[in-house]
Interface confidence: medium
C-alpha cells in the first residue's frame, strides 16, 4: 500500500476534519466532570477517575487503553495531628496559630477529603526560633543577606514569599544557608492583581488562600526511592535516608492573613531595597527576630506529615499508526490535582479528552494516523512528575528508539491574554505554520489568525513579525522525555500579559479556590481559549503523526545555537583577565556551531529534493530528523544531575521552572569569582566548553549524508 492508501487520506479526513470536530462545549462539560471532587494522587478518587478515563477513551475509539501502576513515595498531612505555625511567648505559650485549613469556596462546604495546605515531602519537626525574612529565597536573595547585609540564617526559621522561582529551589537555598525551618507565603504583590476582587467575586487570592506544592529537588529522578528505574512490583527501594531530593528541614505554606501576623512584628535590619517589599502593611524588616516589644517571642513550627509508598495509576491510550506503527507521537498531561484542579490540571485534561474524542471519531470513520499516537493521563505530577517519569523509565528503550515527539498538556490556561509556547527549536516552524491556519479567539482580532494576535501581543525580541517562543524548563511532565531521553517536546497554553510577573503563576494556583467556577466565570466563559489550545496541541499532534516528512526544521536549531553561544561567551567575557590567564577559548564551540549551521542547511536542501515515494529514503531522512534531538543527549548527564542529560537545555539550577541554555557551561561560570580554587573552577569551564562543542559537532554529523 502507498502511504496515502494506508492512511486513507481523503479531503474529509485531513487536519481540518480533526480540528472541526473539536468543540468548546465538550471541553466545558469534561472540565465540569473532572472538577467536582478532589483527585489527589494516591487516593481512591483519583483511581476511580483513572478508570473512568480509561473507559471513555475506549468508547471514543482508541485501539487499546491500559492502566500502568507504580508504587512511589508520596506525602500526606497527618489527619489527626494537623500542621501549623505558632508565635510563642517566653513561657512557651502559643499566642497565635496559623489556620489549619482554607475556608471552603461557596458550594463546596460539604466536600470531604480536601487536603489542607501543606508542603509535600516536608520532614516532621517542631523547630522554634527567630524569624528571618528572605524575600523570594532566590540565590541572589541569600547573596544579598549573607554577603552584603552579613545576616546569618543558621539556626533560624526563614519566611519566604512564593513566586519568581520553583518552591523547591527556595527550600534548597534555605537549607544551604543553615535554616532550620521554612515558612512559605503568598504576598499580595505577587498573587493579588490590582483592580480585581478576591474569589469568589474575582480571580484573586483571598487572605486565607494557600498554595500547596512539593518541595523536592529531584533533578529529574522521578520516584525518590527508585531513581533511574521503574517503581514496579520487584523494585529495590532505597532507604529514606538515601532517597533523592527530600528536604531536610520542616516547611509549611500559609496565606497572607497569617503572614501579616508573623511579618508585622519583624525587627532587625530594614529591607535592603524596594524589591524586598511586598504589598502587606508591614515593614518587611529582615530580622532576625521580632522588634523590641516582642523580642522575647519566637516562632514555632508543628509539622507532622508522613511519607508513604503509595500506588499511582497512569492511563495510556494507543491509536496505532497505519504506516509507521513503531514511531510514537505522545500527547500527555496529568490527572492528579491538589484539590479540585479547576485549572491545574483539569483544564488540560479536558482538552486532552476532547482531542482523544476527535481522533476517535476520525478513526471510527476509517482513518488512521501515519504514526502511532500515544495518549497519557499521568498520575502524581504534583508530587514530582512521578507518573510520567516512572512510565518513561519503564519504557525507556522503546522511547529512545521510537519516540518522535512529546506534546505536554497540563493547564490550558494561566490567563486569557495570548498564546504561550515553549518548545524545541525543531518545532518552531510547525508552531508558526499551524497558528497561521488557526483563528484567533482574542477580542479585537476577529477574522485574524492566531499567529497574528500572538505576534502582536508577544513579539519575538529578535525576529520582526514573529512571536516569542521560549525555552523548555521543567516543572512539568515533558521533563523526562526532553531532558533525559532527548525526545523533541513542546507545550502550549493561554497566558497572561507577558509583562507581568512570570513565575508566580495565576493567583489561585494550587489553592482550594481553583474550581470549575473560577474558569467558567472569570477566565474563559465561552471556553474559546480552551478550544484554541486544543487546536494548537491537537494540531501539533496531528501534524507530527501524519505528515509524510516530519515537520522539524533543523535550521532553527542552528540559529538558536549561535544565539546561545553568543550569550554564554558574553557571560564568560565578564572575566577577561581570567579567560586570558587560564587560556579559556570558545573557538571550538563557535566552530561546531558553524559546522552545524552548514550541515543543517545542506540537509534541508536534500530534504526538499529527495524522492518521497521511496519508503527507505523517506524513513532514513525522517530518522535523521527524529534522532537529532537525541544527539544532544550526553549519556553521562550534567555535573551532579545525571538525569538532566540534554547539553543544550536544562532546568536552571536556581529555578526548576526556567530553562537554561548551555547549562553545563553556565553553571561552571556561575559565581565563579567566589570560588576558592579559581584554577579548578576555570578548568571546569574549559571542560564544559569541550563537552558542548563536541556534542554540537556530533549532532551536526548525524545530519550529514549517511555515506
Amino acid at each position: 500500500k502507498s502511504s496515502n492508501e494506508a492512511t486513507n487520506i481523503t479531503p474529509k479526513h485531513n487536519m481540518k476534519a480533526f480540528l472541526d470536530e473539536l468543540k468548546a462545549e465538550n471541553i466545558k462539560k469534561f472540565l465540569y466532570n473532572f472538577t467536582q471532587i478532589p483527585h489527589l494522587a494516591g487516593t481512591e478518587q483519583n483511581f476511580q477517575l483513572a478508570k473512568q478515563i480509561q473507559s471513555q477513551w475506549k468508547e471514543f475509539g482508541l485501539d487499546s487503553v491500559e492502566l500502568a501502576h507504580y508504587d512511589v513515595l508520596l506525602s500526606y498531612p497527618n489527619k489527626t495531628h494537623p500542621n501549623y505555625i505558632s508565635i510563642i511567648n517566653e513561657d512557651g505559650n502559643e499566642i497565635f496559630n496559623t489556620s489549619l485549613f482554607e475556608p471552603p469556596p461557596p458550594g463546596y462546604e460539604n466536600v470531604s477529603d480536601i487536603v489542607p495546605p501543606f508542603s509535600a515531602f516536608s520532614p516532621q519537626g517542631m523547630p522554634e526560633g527567630d524569624l528571618v525574612y528572605v524575600n523570594y529565597a532566590r540565590t541572589e536573595d541569600f547573596f544579598k543577606l549573607e554577603r552584603d547585609m552579613k545576616i546569618n540564617c543558621s539556626g533560624k526559621i526563614v519566611i519566604a514569599r512564593y513566586g519568581k522561582v520553583f518552591r523547591g529551589n527556595k527550600v534548597k537555598n534555605a537549607q544551604l544557608a543553615g535554616a532550620k525551618g521554612v515558612i512559605l507565603y503568598s504576598d499580595p504583590a505577587d498573587y493579588f492583581a490590582p483592580g480585581v476582587k478576591s474569589y469568589p467575586d474575582g480571580w484573586n487570592l483571598p487572605g486565607g488562600g494557600v498554595q500547596r506544592g512539593n518541595i523536592l529537588n529531584l533533578n529529574g529522578a522521578g520516584d525518590p526511592l527508585t531513581p533511574g528505574y521503574p517503581a514496579n512490583e520487584y523494585a529495590y527501594r532505597r532507604g529514606i535516608a538515601e532517597a533523592v531530593g527530600l528536604p531536610s528541614i520542616p516547611v509549611h505554606p500559609i496565606g497572607y492573613y497569617d503572614a501579616q501576623k508573623l511579618l508585622e512584628k519583624m525587627g532587625g535590619s530594614a529591607p535592603p531595597d524596594s524589591s524586598w517589599r511586598g504589598s502587606l502593611k508591614v515593614p518587611y524588616n529582615v530580622g532576625p527576630g521580632f522588634t523590641g516589644n516582642f523580642s522575647t517571642q519566637k516562632v514555632k513550627m508543628h509539622i507532622h506529615s508522613t511519607n508513604e509508598v503509595t500506588r499511582i495509576y497512569n492511563v495510556i491510550g494507543t491509536l496505532r499508526g497505519a504506516v509507521e506503527p513503531d514511531r510514537y507521537v505522545i500527547l500527555g498531561g496529568h490527572r492528579d490535582s491538589w484539590v479540585f484542579g479547576g485549572i491545574d490540571p483539569q483544564s488540560g485534561a479536558a482538552v486532552v479528552h476532547e482531542i482523544v474524542r476527535s481522533f476517535g471519531t476520525l478513526k471510527k470513520e476509517g482513518w488512521r494516523p501515519r504514526r502511532t499516537i500515544l495518549f497519557a493521563s499521568w498520575d502524581a505530577e504534583e508530587f514530582g512528575l512521578l507518573g510520567s517519569t516512572e512510565w518513561a523509565e519503564e519504557n525507556s528503550r522503546l522511547l529512545q528508539e521510537r519516540g518522535v515527539a512529546y506534546i505536554n498538556a497540563d493547564s490550558s490556561i494561566e490567563g486569557n491574554y495570548t498564546l504561550r509556547v515553549d518548545c524545541t527549536p525543531l518545532m518552531y516552524s510547525l508552531v508558526h505554520n499551524l497558528t497561521k491556519e488557526l483563528k484567533s479567539p482574542d477580542e479585537g482580532f476577529e477574522g485574524k489568525s492566531l499567529y497574528e494576535s500572538w505576534t502582536k501581543k508577544s513579539p519575538s525580541p529578535e525576529f520582526s513579525g514573529m512571536p516569542r517562543i521560549s525555552k523548555l524548563g521543567s516543572g512539568n511532565d515533558f521533563e523526562v522525555f526532553f531532558q533525559r531521553l532527548g525526545i523533541a517536546s513542546g507545550r502550549a497554553r493561554y497566558t497572561k500579559n507577558w509583562e507581568t510577573n512570570k513565575f508566580s503563576g495565576y493567583p489561585l494556583y494550587h489553592s482550594v479556590y481553583e474550581t470549575y467556577e473560577l474558569v467558567e466565570k472569570f477566565y474563559d466563559p465561552m471556553f474559546k481559549y480552551h478550544l484554541t489550545v486544543a487546536q494548537v496541541r491537537g494540531g501539533m499532534v496531528f501534524e507530527l503523526a501524519n505528515s509524510i516528512v516530519l515537520p522539524f526544521d533543523c535550521r532553527d536549531y542552528a540559529v538558536v545555537l549561535r544565539k546561545y553561544a553568543d550569550k554564554i561567551y558574553s557571560i564568560s567575557m565578564k572575566h577577561p583577565q581570567e579567560m586570558k590567564t587560564y587560556s579559556v577559548s570558545f573557538d571550538s564551540l563557535f566552530s561546531a556551531v558553524k559546522n552545524f549551521t552548514e550541515i543543517a542547511s545542506k540537509f534541508s536542501e536534500r530534504l526538499q529534493d529527495f524522492d518521497k515515494s521511496n519508503p527507505i529514503v523517506l524513513r532514513m531522512m525522517n530518522d535523521q530528523l527524529m534522532f537529532l534531538e537525541r544527539a544532544f543527549i550526553d549519556p553521562l548527564g550534567l555535573p551532579d544531575r545525571p538525569f538532566y542529560r540534554h547539553v543544550i537545555y536544562a532546568p536552571s539550577s536556581h529555578n526548576k521552572y526556567a530553562g537554561e541554555s548551555f547549562p553545563g557551561i553556565y553553571d561552571a561560570l556561575f559565581d565563579i569569582e567566589s570560588k576558592v580554587d579559581p584554577s579548578k573552577a576555570w578548568g571546569e569551564v574549559k571542560r564544559q566548553i569541550y563537552v558542548a562543542a563536541f556534542t554540537v559537532q556530533a549532532a551536526a554529523e548525524t545530519l550529514s549524508e549517511v555515506a
Epitope: 525580541p461 529578535e462 520582526s464 521560549s470 509583562e499 544565539k563 550569550k567 558574553s570 529555578n655
Partner: nanobody, 119 residues
C-alpha cells in the same frame, strides 16, 4: 545584581513630549540575550507594554502607541530612553523600565516613576 532606575520629569504638559531615561547598573546593556523595555501602569489598571529594544538594536513598539514612541539606547552610558510625544491626560501613569530575555525567567523591573500629564 542587575538593577534598573528610571529618571525624568514627573510632570509633563499636554501635547508636549514625555522623556524618560533608564540607567542599568550591575550588568551591561549590550549583553547578548536580553532586551530592554518600557511599560506603564495607569492608576488601578494592569501593565501596558510600550515597547522594547533588543541588544542587537532591533526595536518593537506596541501598535497602539507606535506613532508616538521612540525608544533608543546609549551603550556607552549603559542607558536606554523613552520618548512619548503629543501626550494627553490618558498618558498619566507609573512608567517602568524593565529587562527581559527570550525566557520567561529573565524579567526584572525598575521601581517606576509617576508621570502626570497636566497643564
Amino acid at each position: 545584581q542587575v538593577q534598573l532606575q528610571e529618571s525624568g520629569p514627573g510632570l509633563v504638559k499636554p501635547s508636549q513630549t514625555l522623556s524618560l531615561t533608564c540607567t542599568v547598573s550591575g550588568g551591561s546593556i549590550s549583553n547578548s540575550g536580553y532586551y530592554w523595555s518600557w511599560v506603564r501602569q495607569h492608576p488601578g489598571k494592569g501593565l501596558e507594554w510600550i515597547g522594547f529594544i533588543y541588544y542587537n538594536g532591533s526595536i518593537h513598539y506596541n501598535p497602539s502607541l507606535k506613532s508616538r514612541v521612540i525608544i533608543s539606547v546609549d551603550t556607552s552610558k549603559n542607558q536606554f530612553s523613552l520618548k512619548l510625544n503629543s501626550v494627553t491626560a490618558a498618558d498619566t501613569a507609573v512608567y517602568y523600565c524593565a529587562r527581559d530575555g527570550d525566557d520567561y525567567g529573565d524579567y526584572l523591573r525598575g521601581q517606576g516613576t509617576l508621570v502626570t500629564v497636566s497643564s
